[in-house]
Every structure is written in C-alpha cells, then in structure tokens.
C-alpha cells in the first residue's frame, strides 16, 4: 500500500508540476519592467516571454505582440524556447510511461519488468524537471546581469516575472514527483538488485550409488 | 587622474571616412564598469551623442548614424576609436571622447576638430 | 528617442542674482525601479569641454559649489543658480541618461 500510495502522490506532483511548466512555458512575464510614465494614467508595464511581449497600461488595458521573426530572436530566447517545450514534451512522454509501470494499471504485466518501467517515468519527471531548469535559471542569469551591468541604462532594466518562480516551483514538483516515482518503484520490489536477475534453486544431486535419500520419501 | 585626448585628420574629403582615436590614461578598459562615450558638437551648436563601447565589448550607438559608425578598442593601449564612413559637410565638428560612468559623461577629453571640405 | 527642450536659450544676468533655467523631456525620466529621475547638467565654458555639474536630478558631482541646485521630476526640470558667480559665465546643457541614445537639450546660455 505504501508503494501505491508513493506512486499516487508522485504522479500528482508530477502532473502539477507539469501544468505549471505548460503555464510557464506560455506566459509573457519572463521579464518584467515597470515604466512609471509622467503620471498615474500613462503608468505602464512591459512583459517579455518567449513567444510574445506585452504592455499593460494602468487603466487595465493590455496589448500583446507576437514576435514573428524567429531570426530577430536572441539565442537565449531561441534556446528557452527549444529546452522549455522539449520538457514539455519529455513530461508528456513521463506520463505514460509512469502510468504503464503503476500497480494500479495493466498496460505492463506485474513484476519486475513493470518496476523497471515506473522507476523509468520517475527518472524521465527527474530529467524534465532539470532540463526546464537549465533555461529558466540560464534567462534570470540574464536578467540579474543585466540588471546591475552600468552599460545597461536604467530603460533596458528589466526584473524577474512571474513566469520564471511559476517555472521554478514546476520544475521542484517535477523533481519532487519523480523521485516519489522512483521511491515507489523501489519500494513495490523490495529494494531489488537494479538488474532484476532469476533466482533458481539448484535440484539435489543423486548419490553416486544412484539411490536417493530415504529422507525423501514419506 | 582620468585624462583623454582626441587624435584625427583635421580636415578630410566628402565620401572619405573619418578616423578618430582616444588615447586615455587614469583608467583601464577592462576594468568592469568602464566605458567610453564618443560625442560631437557642431560649432555655435548643441552637444549630439554618437556611441559608447564598454569594458565587456557591448556597444550602443546612435540610431540615427547607425549604418556609418564603428567603434571599437584596444585596451592593452589604452586606446578607443570611432570610425564615421561617408562623411559630409554636416559631420564638421567637435568630436570629443568622454569616460563614463554609466550613462553619464564625467571625464571628457579636450576634442578635435573634424572639417568636412573638399 | 527622447528629445530634450531648454529654455531659454540665452539669458543675460548680473553677479549675485539668482538664475534659474528649464529642460523638458518628451517623456518620463522617472525609473520606478529606485523612484529616481535620470537627468543630468553640463557646463561648458567658451572654448572648454563640458564638465559634469549634476545627476539623478538633484546630485552634485564633487567639486561642484552648492549654489548649483537641480530639482524637478518626471518630464520638468530646473537647474538654478543661487547667485551667479562672473565664473559662470557658460553654456548650460541638460541630458538625459535614463535611456539610449543619450541625448541632450540644445543648451542655455548664460551671460554675465
């Protein structure tokens, strides 16, 4: 029951975690910059994410712009976009393959073969997790120096959006998710040898004379 | 002490492009925050930025002669330059370089003047 | 770009006097991020270079006498003279350095 139960919670949090990557991966806030304008009225806010970029007036009106050119792109932006929608897609793969080795589905029959392929899905949330993590980390990276670069005037200075944290605690479900997964897999084999080998029991050998122990007979 | 000193022709040709070099002592170009600001001033005129280069590469240069100036460095020599292609009577000016700190110019130089004649 | 507007363009006053003059920006140099204004003054005495007087609006760079005073915010500014000095005898430019390209108004001139 403890292993199902590991296995449950490990796919929640992975699910989770998952959604909010998908979130991530869509929202315009990567980075944010606050223009205060000459007054309340004119106050704006700039977002930038990896499909689009947008500007939120304070009287709540929002325009958003596409980008449409993939070569005007910057690499960073190219490479986020590459690395966070091949998590994405790596998470969906995670899916099935985590629920073909759970004990409550028949897609593998029981066994250590079915072991193998939950601890699989858990390794792959683990992968997703850390393969998201490398662009959202690599973008603050980013942000942060740019930030205090004295090149960069204060108009170009942008902060870290909301997009980045959603991502972040996506990726933590993710990897939290997928070590439960691996943890329940274990568990379910009772620690088994990695390699899952066939144990047999040797039959007794006949004495020389060819006759059997009388023991062995009632 | 910052010093910079502006070194050109003096006078060159319409078409001809314009070499300038900034020769500075009292600060380094590899030194993180530094940069050097290129601007003119037309005589009986106002002040017009043309470039910065910094001590990481980054350059930032005015839209408007966007597609005729080059900047550049050469820190080991202590040395900065702008390079202003197709020259006409209107680039007749001052040009002076300037050390900055951020985006202000704390440090300039004496200027040189530049004249556009044929 | 942001374009920067002086007025007046030449103002003619006496030693001791007080002397104020305006720079206006085409747009807010306020950066909400520290609240701070991104304008800056230059003097430049006939036949010098410029020297940096002020920054962040308000801001002395050192060295500079305390009868210079910056104020305004977002799109006015003001520099003022508390009493003119025959020294101060100059051009007067403001810039902004909020954003690039740096730009500059087209300078007030002041004479003694």
């Known amino acids: 029951m403890g292993s199902a139960a590991l296995e449950i919670l490990g796919l929640v949090l992975c699910l989770v975690g998952w959604g909010g990557l998908i979130l991530a991966c869509a929202l315009p806030q990567w980075r944010i910059y606050s223009y205060a304008g000459d007054n309340i009225v004119t106050a704006q806010a700039m977002y930038e994410g990896l499909w689009m970029s947008c500007v939120s007036q304070s009287t709540g009106q929002i325009q958003c712009k596409v980008f449409d050119s993939l070569l005007n792109l910057s690499s960073t932006v190219q490479a986020a976009r590459a690395l966070t929608v091949s998590a994405v897609l790596l998470a969906f793969v995670a899916l099935f393959v985590t629920l073909a080795g759970a004990q409550c589905t028949t897609c593998v029959a029981p066994g250590p073969a079915k072991a193998r392929v939950a601890l699989t899905g858990g390794v792959l949330y683990l992968f997703c997790g850390l393969l998201a993590l490398v662009p959202l980390c690599w973008f603050a990276n980013i942000v942060v120096r740019e930030f205090y670069d004295p090149s960069v005037p204060v108009s170009q200075k942008y902060e870290l959006g909301a997009a980045l944290y959603i991502g972040w605690a996506a990726t933590a479900l993710l990897m939290v998710g997928g070590c439960l997964l691996c943890c329940g897999a274990w568990v379910c084999t009772g620690r088994p040898d990695l390699s899952f080998p066939v144990k047999y029991s040797a039959p007794r050998r006949p004495t020389a004379t060819g006759d059997y122990d009388k023991k062995n007979y009632v | 002490q910052v010093t910079l000193k502006e070194s050109g022709p003096g006078i060159l040709q319409p078409s001809h492009t314009l070499s300038l070099t900034c020769s500075f002592s009292g600060f380094s170009l590899n030194t993180y925050g530094v940069g050097v600001n290129w601007i003119r001033q037309p005589s009986g005129k106002g002040l017009e930025w043309l470039a910065s280069i910094w001590w990481h590469g980054k350059t930032y240069i005015n839209p408007s002669l966007k597609n005729r100036l080059t900047v550049s460095k050469d820190p080991s020599n202590n040395q900065a330059f702008l390079e202003v292609t197709n020259v006409d009577p209107a680039d007749t000016a001052t040009y002076y370089c300037?050390?900055?700190?951020?985006?202000?110019?704390?440090?300039w130089g004496q200027g040189v003047m530049v004249t556009v004649s044929s | 770009d942001i374009v920067m507007t002086q007025t007046p363009s030449s103002q003619a006053v006496s030693a001791g006097e007080k002397v104020t003059m305006s720079c206006k920006s085409s747009q807010s140099l306020l950066y909400s991020g520290d609240q701070k204004n991104y304008l800056a003054w230059y003097q430049q005495k006939p036949g010098q270079s410029p020297k940096l007087l002020i920054y962040?609006?308000?801001t002395r760079e050192s060295g500079v006498p305390d009868r210079f005073i910056g104020s305004g915010s977002g799109t006015d500014f003001t520099l003022t003279i508390s009493s003119v000095q025959a020294e101060d005898l100059a051009d007067y430019y403001c810039?902004?350095?909020?954003?690039?390209?740096?730009?500059f108004g087209s300078g007030t001139k002041l004479e003694i």
């Open positions: 810039q902004q350095h909020y954003s690039y390209p740096l730009t």
């Open positions: 300037a050390h900055a700190r951020a985006q202000l110019l704390d440090y």
């Open positions: 962040l609006t308000s």
